[in-house]
């Protein structure tokens, strides 16, 4: 029961994590305009992996895709690649883990096969989570590097746009979504690997030797502290590994009712 719970929870946590990675990859707010020097701007810029957007205070938003591939900075391409690899591995891991779930019966699949599939999906989730965390961290590092280099005509490394003196970019919501989602996927993967240990049948090098006495038939297994009557199965005591993770909702601060500018 503990194994099933651990495996099921690992699957759910990974599912949420991968959904978060997909959401982060699609989000436009990877970097947002830093308003420290200009808090009263009527034009707000933010950028994603695939397009850059401008939101006017009038409420109109215009987004433009990065329609070039070769013209994009290598770092941005690397982040895209890491996120896509993370999504693909996560998606495959989810497919594999569905078939590996102990609560789902598929033909006469043995526990050893399910254990292998659980381990495979766990490893995939771990790598997927690491890819997402790495991608987001590389992008964050890129932002930190560029933050103080906001001189006129500086190449921002974001789709080849020219930057004026005032505009600097800081961490956007997608980075935090990506970090949390990557972490969840990683935790889910670890839980799957733990569940795999519980699913794997214990293999012994020696066959059990039966000694037939005049009375009851009792089977003795060498090297063990357990004895069985041959009718019931051994019950194993296992720890339940409860991997919990919290996500913080992004809080969007609206202008106050009395915003003086």
């Amino acid at each position: 029961m503990a194994v099933t719970a651990c495996q099921g929870l690992g699957f759910v946590v990974s599912l949420i994590g991968i959904a978060g990675i997909i959401a982060a990859t699609c989000m436009d707010q990877w970097s947002t305009q830093d308003l420290y020097n200009n808090p009263v701007t009527a034009v707000f810029n933010y950028q994603g992996l695939w397009r850059s957007c401008v939101r006017e205070s009038s409420g109109f938003t215009e987004c433009r895709g990065y329609f070039t591939l070769l013209g994009l900075p290598a770092m941005l391409q690397a982040v895209r690649a890491l996120m896509i690899v993370g999504i693909v591995l996560g998606a495959i891991g989810l497919l594999v883990s569905i078939f590996a779930l102990k609560c789902i019966r598929i033909g006469s699949m043995e526990d050893s096969a399910k254990a292998n599939m659980t381990l495979t999906s766990g490893i995939m989730f771990i790598v997927s989570g690491l890819c997402a965390i790495a991608g987001v961290s590389v992008f964050a590092n890129m932002l930190v590097t560029n933050f103080w280099m906001s001189t006129a005509n500086m190449y921002t490394g974001m789709g080849g746009m020219v930057q004026t003196v005032q505009t600097r970019y800081t961490f956007g919501a997608a980075l935090f979504v990506g970090w949390v989602a990557g972490g969840l996927t990683l935790i889910g993967g670890v839980m799957m690997c733990i569940a795999c240990r519980g699913l794997a049948p214990e293999e012994t090098n020696y066959k059990a030797v039966s000694y037939h006495a005049s009375g009851h038939s009792v089977a003795y297994k060498p090297g063990g502290f357990k004895a069985s009557t041959g009718f019931g199965s051994n019950t194993k005591n296992k720890k339940i590994y409860d991997g919990g993770a919290r996500t913080e909702d992004e809080v969007q601060s609206y202008p106050s009712k009395h915003d003086y500018v």
Epitope: T41, A42, S52, S58, G59, V162, T164, T167, Y254
Partner: antibody, heavy 118, light 113 residues
Framework: QVQLVQSGAEVKKPGASVKVSCKAS????????MNWVRQAPGQRLEWMGQ????????KYNGNFKGRVTITRDTSASTAYMELSSLRSEDTAVYYC???????????WGQGTLVTVSS | DIVMTQSPDSLAVSLGERATINCKSS????????????LTWYQQKPGQPPKLLIY???TRDSGVPDRFSGSGSGTDFTLTISSLQAEDVAVYYC?????????FGGGTKVEIK
Amino acid sequence: QVQLVQSGAEVKKPGASVKVSCKASGYAFSNYWMNWVRQAPGQRLEWMGQIYPGNGDTKYNGNFKGRVTITRDTSASTAYMELSSLRSEDTAVYYCARYYRGNCFDYWGQGTLVTVSS
Amino acid sequence: DIVMTQSPDSLAVSLGERATINCKSSQSLLNSGNQKNYLTWYQQKPGQPPKLLIYWASTRDSGVPDRFSGSGSGTDFTLTISSLQAEDVAVYYCQNAYTYPLTFGGGTKVEIK
């Protein structure tokens, strides 16, 4: 078609308050910021503040030092601008204007003349 | 606050001739995100509210005759009336649409010579 109809002219004494209304029609009132701009005789246009009727958010020009209050009644598609502690230099034509793409004012009310005189 | 300075204060041009109005801002109005200049031009005839002519420094509003054109970038902008008509007699204002508080130029009065 879009129309912004303002209330009639007002004569006020110094220290009093004035409340000007602006009734919108021909568009979704709640979806566009409504601005107030004034024009004193021989002076340049001066932006006073704006309100988003959808949620009541407001932004004000700090030069008015908290004397301006902008409100709205979405059910009546009407925006209001109240200016308190009136002075003679507040004598001006007050306009409401819809905020549009490019952060410009694409439709204006006909204007309301507010005269502050003792 | 961004200060908008218009020149000249008044301008007398013959019918059919070109009229040029200048507007200078104390800070750049160019937004790097979309490479657009947040400057707007309005026309105000006597006894009427201002009328939108041009936004984003060079984009004409619908219904505005093509003899009106806007140009410039950063801090220096120009409104040009290629062939002045009698109905173009008015005061023209530029407006900073980039930073709060939104500010206007002092206006340029265009008359017929």
